[in-house]
């Protein structure tokens, strides 16, 4: 990043430094340290104080965004004296040049698209680059396939999500020969950005009095089990008057996904389709293909 780091410190400095790649704040260890603490303050005056590392001369910030600018602060007491130092981390570059309207979504269980728009004051030669770091191994993923608009990167397609974890840090850097470009960063939960496929293997079997609908839970990127799903069934009688209410049935995920409903012979032609959602978010998938049952002369 092309961010200026400005230090505000008394004469005997702790030499505080920040590595944005590892989110690690470190300083020179002092002999006979009795107390140390580090924290950051963001533009909204929110304070984040991480745990100190074992050596007590560094700390790592886990879940922070830096694009609005932050101030790091380190306090150290030794048996002789106290030290205090601030480190300003501004988002340098011309205001309004950073990528904006950034969003990502996971689809088909193992694909992800991220998109953004060029900043309103960005010069014509601006180029953006996306980097993703997972929360666990701090591994960095560089965008493998960019989506372009007139030569400018405005999106990214990933077809290998193995490096992601449940929460990930996204950074869009910018470059230009003319001026400094601000960066944009964001933390995204995979569970909030995944769009499920509809349920698969939908079948309907009827006897003289009932019909049984069965289906399989969709394959997902997230590690989900059966209780994490909520389903909606749309059982629809064909050839009914426009405006007739469809019967929408909510069904909780189960080891065997099934819904049994009364429907006696002779039965009119019906269709059923199913969609799925995460039970906690209810971000519905598209509907499955409609399955027809019953007869026209029912």
């Amino acid at each position: 990043e092309k961010s200026d780091l400005r230090t505000v410190a008394p004469a005997s400095s702790l030499n505080v430094r920040f590595d944005s790649r590892t989110m690690n704040l470190s300083w020179d260890c002092q002999e006979n340290t009795t107390f140390s603490k580090c924290f950051l303050t963001d533009k909204k005056n929110r304070v984040v104080e991480p745990r100190l590392s074992n050596n007590e001369c560094s700390c790592t910030f886990r879940e922070i965004c830096l694009h609005e600018g932050v101030t790091f602060e380190v306090h150290v007491n030794t048996s002789q004296r106290g030290f205090q130092q601030k480190l300003l981390y501004p988002n340098s570059g011309r205001e309004g040049t950073a990528a904006q309207n950034f969003s990502c979504f996971i689809y088909n269980a193992d694909l992800m698209n991220c998109t953004w728009a060029r900043g309103p004051t960005a010069p014509r030669d601006v180029q953006y680059f996306l980097y993703i770091r997972n929360s666990k191994r701090r591994r960095e993923i560089r965008c493998p396939y960019y989506i372009q608009d007139s030569g400018t990167h405005v999106g990214c397609h990933l077809d290998n999500l193995s490096g992601l974890t449940s929460r990930n840090y996204f950074l869009v850097n910018g470059t230009s020969r003319e001026i400094g470009i601000q960066f944009f960063d964001s933390l995204l939960d995979t569970k909030k950005i995944e769009r499920f496929n509809p349920p698969s293997n939908v079948t309907v079997r009827c006897n003289t009095t009932h019909c049984l609908v069965r289906w399989k839970q969709p394959r997902t990127y997230q590690k989900l089990s059966y209780l994490d799903f909520q389903y909606q069934l749309d059982v629809h009688r064909k050839n009914t008057q426009p405006g007739t209410e469809n019967l929408l049935i909510n069904v909780s995920g189960d080891l065997e996904n099934r819904y049994n409903f009364p429907s006696s012979e002779p039965r009119a032609k019906h269709s059923v389709k199913i969609r799925a959602a995460d039970v906690r978010i209810l971000n519905w998938s598209s509907w499955s293909e409609a399955i027809e049952f019953g007869s026209d002369d029912g």
Epitope: T165, S166, K223, L224, S225, L227, L255, E256, R280
Partner: antibody, heavy 120, light 111 residues
Framework: QVQLVQSGAEVKKPGASVKVSCKIS????????IHWVRQTPTKGFEWMGG????????VYAQRFQGRVTMTEDTSIDTAYLTLSSLRSDDTAVYYC?????????????WGKGTMVTVSS | QAVLTQPSSVSGAPGQRVTISCTGS?????????VSWYQQLPGTAPKLLIY???KRPSGVPDRFSASKSGTSASLAITGLQADDEADYYC???????????FGGGTKVTVL
């Protein structure tokens, strides 16, 4: 109807090992995650470990690490728990269970339990 | 000593409402992790009653409800019935212990 059928009660001497089996019927084990929990009158329920899809491996509770092994034979839809170097305080009912949700771990269906008694 | 604290027993007359509390800490319920509740009838295996704080698996009557706030959770049983007499356990994950943890259990007696 999905069921978990566990092996019968065991009586073991201190220092010995015990292997408890858990047979799944009505569903394929390869599509499920099995975890093991034990229950004692003094300590209540203790989670022992099970398959973690995030790590793509079986993870064990710290306090049982080194003494416990969990294995699976998907060809016969059976999961196994082996606990070695048994002590008298390992006397407990051991349950296998199917994970209903991973975040956080929620045990959706339980076996009937296997009583293991450790006594000299 | 269980990581999650529950009252050892509660009781109520048939038709009444009883609640069971489950108190944790900032490393488990307050982390925040979802809470699940299990019912164990005498001499049987536990059965899942509530998951994701307040969701009921299919087959569990709506007389059972639960909620979570801060570092504690509670289970409510309305219209108490004789066959609700059982031990009830709360459970969640504890990040300090890196695994699932349970409450010590609450015996519900129907008077």
């Amino acid at each position: 109807q999905v069921q978990l059928v566990q092996s019968g009660a065991e009586v073991k001497k201190p220092g010995a090992s015990v292997k408890v089996s858990c047979k799944i019927s009505g569903h394929s084990l390869s599509e499920l995650s099995i975890h093991w929990v034990r229950q004692t009158p003094t300590k209540g329920f203790e989670w022992m470990g099970g398959f973690d899809p995030e790590e793509n491996e079986i993870v064990y509770a710290q306090r049982f690490q080194g003494r416990v092994t969990m294995t699976e034979d998907t060809s016969i839809d059976t999961a196994y728990l082996t606990l070695s170097s048994l002590r008298s305080d390992d006397t407990a009912v051991y349950y296998c269970s199917i994970v209903g949700s991973f975040s956080p771990l929620t045990l959706g269906l339980w076996g009937k339990g296997t009583m293991v008694t450790v006594s000299s | 000593q269980a990581v999650l604290t529950q009252p050892s027993s509660v009781s109520g007359a048939p038709g009444q409402r009883v609640t069971i509390s489950c108190t944790g800490s900032g490393s488990n319920i307050g982390a925040p992790y979802d809470v699940s509740w299990y019912q164990q009838l005498p001499g049987t295996a536990p059965k899942l009653l509530i998951y994701h704080n307040n969701k009921r698996p299919s087959g569990v009557p709506d007389r059972f409800s639960a909620s979570k706030s801060g570092t504690s959770a509670s289970l409510a049983i309305t219209g108490l019935q004789a066959d609700d007499e059982a031990d009830y356990y709360c459970a969640t994950v504890d990040e300090a212990l890196s695994g699932s943890v349970f409450g010590g259990g609450t015996k519900v007696t129907v008077l």
